[in-house]
């Protein structure tokens, strides 16, 4: 009896694991084995596929074959008993195109109100993703074990910290990788759970802000208790992307070590151009807080996010405000090549009641003013990038009197 060729061959590639699955064409015939050959692009001869010769099951692994993952490959299979079936040719494919990203490895650390997530590619030193190691981004789904209400967090890197959690609570999460450059989304890791600790005696510092004064950066934060000492550390933001080494060498800012106030001043030249993460920790001599939330700090934006300059055209019932580029020393305008939004605050000179307008435009109307009344205006700029979320300081207040009635035209 002639043996039939096997059918429905499927190639599954996850990271560096190459698996073949197929259907037996004739279940009634026993003791059949299967063998594969492969052929590279531009070659005429077929080569035996090691790991997939004389297989008795309907699955084999050819991960040991050192292939160029960007090169097209063709496979063929046949059944063997006393005689052999005809070859069944599988559609040619490129391993890299066919490959899926496997589940990443996840390592969790708990604090009282935060969880640190360290993510590594599932296959260490993967051949498949050798050129893409630094391009991986991750997304995760996290939920309280008790409620199951899921929150999704997209576009994170190999280290991510989730804040504002509840103490003594078990959180569960799963993570998947993506290679956005190749339109590949990976499969989720197994679910990992961790319990946050009992609440710490000392809370971490909050509301960290950086501003520029003269040639210095001024770092300010809020703290609940008095008589504390603080230290500030920085890290290059790009190091959060490092997929291999989960050692983060946070650096001390010398002028911000053991400071007794909720601010510290340090020279701008401490940082070269770049994006950094900053964090602050409090200590009372016996106990230490956990680190504050890490804030992103871009020297380019920080240095040049100066308060806006504006002119006011006064009418009887409104002001027209024209916002221009801020001036550097030497009266040259600063070119700001990132989108900004403007916060304009105005108030009647004789009152403390402030009103606020948020505008993307550089010409703004402040409506509903009273004639012949002095109003004061100040403005500041904000970046529109959620992640950087930087603000300039407010400009000096400018006060103007509205015109008499009927001059609004």
């Amino acid at each position: 009896k002639n043996l039939k060729s096997p059918q429905k061959v499927e190639v599954d590639i996850i990271d560096d694991n190459f698996i073949l699955r197929w259907n037996r064409s004739d279940e009634s015939v026993g003791n059949v084995t299967f063998s594969f050959d492969y052929q590279k692009t531009g070659m005429d001869n077929w080569i035996k596929l090691s790991g997939c010769q004389n297989i008795t099951s309907t699955k084999c692994n050819f991960s040991s074959l050192k292939l160029n993952v960007y090169e097209e490959i063709k496979l063929r299979i046949r059944a063997e008993k006393e005689n052999t079936s005809s070859w069944y040719e599988v559609d040619s494919f490129t391993p890299f195109r066919k490959a899926q990203i496997g589940p990443p490895e996840v390592h969790l650390e708990a604090e009282d109100k935060a969880i640190v997530i360290h993510i590594s590619p599932g296959t260490k030193d993967s051949v498949m993703w050798a050129l893409d190691g630094l391009s991986f981004t991750y997304s995760l789904v996290i939920w309280k074990n008790s409620s199951g209400v899921e929150e999704r967090i997209e576009n994170i890197y190999s280290r991510h910290k989730i804040y504002k959690l509840s103490p003594e609570t078990t959180y569960c999460l799963k993570v998947k990788a993506a290679l956005l450059t190749s339109w590949k989304i990976g499969v989720y890791s197994p679910v990992h759970c961790i319990k946050t600790t009992v609440e710490n005696e000392l809370p971490p510092p909050e509301n960290i802000e950086v501003s520029v004064q003269n040639q210095n950066y001024v770092l300010k934060w809020d703290y609940t208790y008095a008589n504390m000492t603080f230290q500030v550390q920085w890290l290059h933001a790009f190091l959060k992307r490092n997929p291999g080494n989960h050692l983060y060498k946070w650096k001390q800012i010398p002028d911000c070590e053991n400071v007794k106030t909720t601010q510290c001043v340090f020279p701008q030249n401490v940082f070269q151009k770049g994006i950094y993460l900053l964090r602050v920790q409090a200590s009372d001599g016996n106990n230490t807080s956990f680190w504050s939330e890490e804030i992103k700090f871009d020297t380019e934006i920080q240095a040049f996010l100066l308060p806006p300059v504006f002119n006011i055209r006064s009418l009887s019932d409104s002001f027209h405000i024209y916002i221009g580029a801020p001036k550097q020393s030497g009266n040259t305008p600063v070119i700001q090549d990132y989108p900004l939004i403007y916060e304009i605050i105005f108030w009647e000179n004789t009152s403390n009641a402030e009103r606020k307008i948020i505008e993307k435009k550089t010409d703004v109307t402040v409506p509903n003013l009273k004639p012949l009344t002095v109003y004061c205006v100040k403005a500041r700029a904000h970046t529109m990038d959620e992640k950087l979320n930087k603000s300039s300081v407010f400009s000096d207040a400018v006060c103007e009197k509205t015109k008499p009635g009927n001059t609004s035209k």
């Epitope: 009282d112 016996n286 956990f290």
Partner: antibody, heavy 118, light 107 residues
Framework: EVQLQQSGAEVVKPGASVKLSCTAS????????MHWVKQRTEQGLECIGR????????KYVPKFQGKATITAETSSNTAYLQLSSLTAEDTAVYYC???????????WGQGTSVTVSS | DVVMTQSRKFMSTSVGDRVSVTCKAS??????VAWYQQKLGQSPKALIY???YRYSGVPDRFTGSGSGTDFTLTISNVQSEDLAEYFC?????????FGGGTKLEIK
């Protein structure tokens, strides 16, 4: 294979100084922290300090500030511990270790015995 | 500095038994605790990090648990080669302090 090879045992006089070395192979010390740890006979482990060989930044346990100086030479992939004004209290085995992922001291040298005796 | 206290200086156990070595931190250190094993005349060796993660090559009879201030290293099915001293260490805040050690004796 990752290895940390420490210099040989030292017998020194009180008041003198000694410099211990720790040469790494199988990895680049610039990518890690290098720690020094003290262990007195029948006693526990005590951190002395650490260095980031990439930029030379050091951190000392306050108790060892002024007593210990940690340096590193990236060209020879070596970390050093210098101990000054030695007293009998400094008689101990000194270990270098690598600070790796998650701050674990994942590899240790074989230890260097320092005996302070007149 | 954070003080790490290992209250039992010595523990006695038999081959095949299960034994738990405990460690208490003077303040909340999250899960930033590692465990090391030191056999007589040898250098310490990393066993557990981040409170519960086993270091590569460490047999799965070694298990770490705990968070906040209370941590435990459990050795199930104790083997004769587990005769050693065990140290905990916190790496939540500098200096990274060690516990005083617990010597495990095999009966």
């Amino acid at each position: 294979e990752v290895q940390l090879q420490q210099s040989g045992a030292e017998v020194v006089k009180p008041g003198a100084s000694v410099k211990l070395s720790c040469t790494a192979s199988g990895f680049n010390i610039k990518d890690y922290y290098m720690h020094w740890v003290k262990q007195r006979t029948e006693q526990g482990l005590e951190c002395i300090g650490r260095i980031d060989p990439e930029d030379g930044e050091t951190k000392y346990v306050p108790k060892f500030q002024g007593k210990a100086t940690i340096t590193a030479e990236t060209s020879s992939n070596t970390a050093y511990l210098q101990l000054s004004s030695l007293t009998a209290e400094d008689t101990a085995v000194y270990y270098c270790s690598r600070g790796g992922s998650y701050y674990v001291m994942d590899y240790w040298g074989q230890g260097t015995s320092v005996t302070v005796s007149s | 500095d954070v003080v790490m206290t290992q209250s039992r200086k010595f523990m006695s156990t038999s081959v095949g038994d299960r034994v738990s070595v405990t460690c208490k931190a003077s303040q909340n250190v999250g899960t930033s605790v590692a465990w090391y094993q030191q056999k007589l005349g040898q250098s310490p060796k990393a066993l557990i990090y981040s409170a519960s993660y086993r270091y590569s090559g460490v047999p799965d009879r070694f298990t770490g648990s705990g968070s906040g201030t209370d941590f435990t290293l459990t050795i199930s099915n104790v083997q004769s080669e587990d005769l050693a001293e065990y140290f905990c260490q916190q790496d939540n805040s500098y200096p990274h302090t060690f516990g005083g050690g617990t010597k495990l004796e095999i009966k």
